[in-house]
Interface confidence: low
């Protein structure tokens, strides 16, 4: 909230890329290097985001828009506007407090990020397992056992379902 000082606030005339400089009788001064204002009438410019360390610059800062960062190879973005970079793991793994760990039996992860998720329980849909699951891949469910000819059934005990979002430490 910025108070309007008068019916014609001099600051309201300051365009994006400038700030209303009270030290200079409220004239519109250009944003100094490494800062920006994305809207008009601003009393300050915002400091440009610096993409340092594990962050790398995806878009340079300009006087009217902030820099945008992404992550260096081996890391991926988390949070709004890539506020964090998290270490990648291999497929078949998940990131725990102790680093990348293989998915437990009965779970899989087909990405370099995120947690291991339980294999699909084919029997809940009245289907059978057509292709067994691995650490990297979910099971493939096929027709129901009744639809299969004798001897063709592939039986894998379903993995106990895990709370979503739970990550084994």
């Amino acid at each position: 909230f910025e108070r309007t000082r008068s019916l014609q606030d001099p600051c309201s005339n300051c365009p994006a890329g400038t700030f209303c400089d009270n030290n200079r009788n409220q004239i519109c001064s250009p944003c100094p290097p490494n800062s920006f204002s994305s809207a008009g009438g601003q009393r300050t410019c915002d400091i440009c985001r610096q993409c340092k360390g594990v962050f790398r610059t995806r878009k340079e800062c300009s006087s009217t828009s902030n820099a945008e960062c992404d992550c260096t190879p081996g890391f991926h973005c988390l949070g709004a506007g890539c506020s964090m970079c998290e270490q990648d793991c291999k497929q078949g793994q998940e990131l725990t407090k102790k680093g990348c760990k293989d998915c437990c039996f009965g779970t899989f992860n087909d990405q370099k990020r995120g947690i291991c998720r339980p294999w699909t329980n084919c029997s809940l849909d009245g289907k059978s397992v057509l292709v067994n699951g691995t650490k990297e891949r979910d099971v493939v469910c096929g027709p129901s056992p009744a639809d299969l000819s004798p001897g063709a059934s592939s039986v894998t005990p379903p993995a106990p379902a895990r709370e979503p979002g739970h990550s084994p430490q």
Partner: antibody, heavy 121, light 107 residues
């Protein structure tokens, strides 16, 4: 690291002038305003004025307008405050302190150690 | 010039006690207010700016609140190192003006 180092104590006669210095180091001198604030013995703080070294733009407290002159020497990263027509009530510790470019996010983040000016006949 | 009235001018509190200092501006200053701490023989140190933004490195027991004309500095649990004089400063308009100060002592 950032430092503002001020000149030593001064004893002056009423009616004379004093020129204090504030030498900056550890940062880009031209990018921060230098403010001067004084504090009479046992009293509160009083803002006297500020200067932007990059272009020597100044603001003065009207109370001191006719007696204070702020200048900078960019080559030595030094700010100066001259106070003329001294009177006994000008006896005070004078501080220089910096604020960054954006007035409305002003933070006096670094201060000099202060210079005691005593005005006595 | 905008007048800043600070109260109390001094206070005595026990260690661990909550301490509150107030500052009232003679006109609306939005949120453009800083709080300073000054120890004897030392330069002031900025604690808070924009009424409630804590300066990096300042302990979280310090907090600021308010906008418009009425502002408060709170020390949630007084520590021995907090013994000092505290000043508010408005910078909504030039010239910036300070409150008269509040001297905080141990009871």
């Amino acid at each position: 690291q950032v430092q503002l180092v001020q000149s030593g104590a001064e004893v002056k006669k009423p009616g004379s002038s004093v020129k204090l210095s504030c030498k900056a180091s550890g940062y880009t001198f031209s990018s921060y305003w230098i403010n001067w604030v004084r504090q009479a013995p046992g009293q509160g703080l009083e803002w006297m004025g500020n200067i932007y070294p990059s272009d020597s733009y100044t603001n003065y407290n009207q109370k001191f307008k006719d007696r204070v002159t702020l200048t900078v020497d960019k080559s030595t990263s030094t700010a100066y405050m001259e106070l003329s027509s001294l009177r006994s009530e000008d006896t005070a510790v004078y501080y220089c302190t910096r604020t960054w470019e954006f007035y409305y996010d002003s933070v006096f983040d670094y201060w000099g150690q202060g210079t005691l000016v005593t005005v006595s006949s | 010039d905008i007048q800043m009235t600070q109260s109390p001018s001094s206070l005595s509190a026990s260690l661990g006690e909550r301490v509150t200092i107030t500052c009232k501006a003679s006109q609306d200053i939005n949120s453009y207010l800083s709080w300073f701490q000054q120890k004897p023989g030392k330069a002031p140190k900025t604690l808070i700016y924009r009424a409630n933004r804590l300066v990096d490195g300042v302990p979280s027991r310090f907090s600021g609140s308010g906008s418009g004309q009425d502002f408060t500095l709170t020390i949630s649990s007084l520590q021995p190192e907090d013994i000092a004089t505290y000043y508010c400063l408005q910078y909504d308009e030039l010239p910036p003006t300070f409150g008269g100060g509040t001297k905080v002592e141990i009871k």
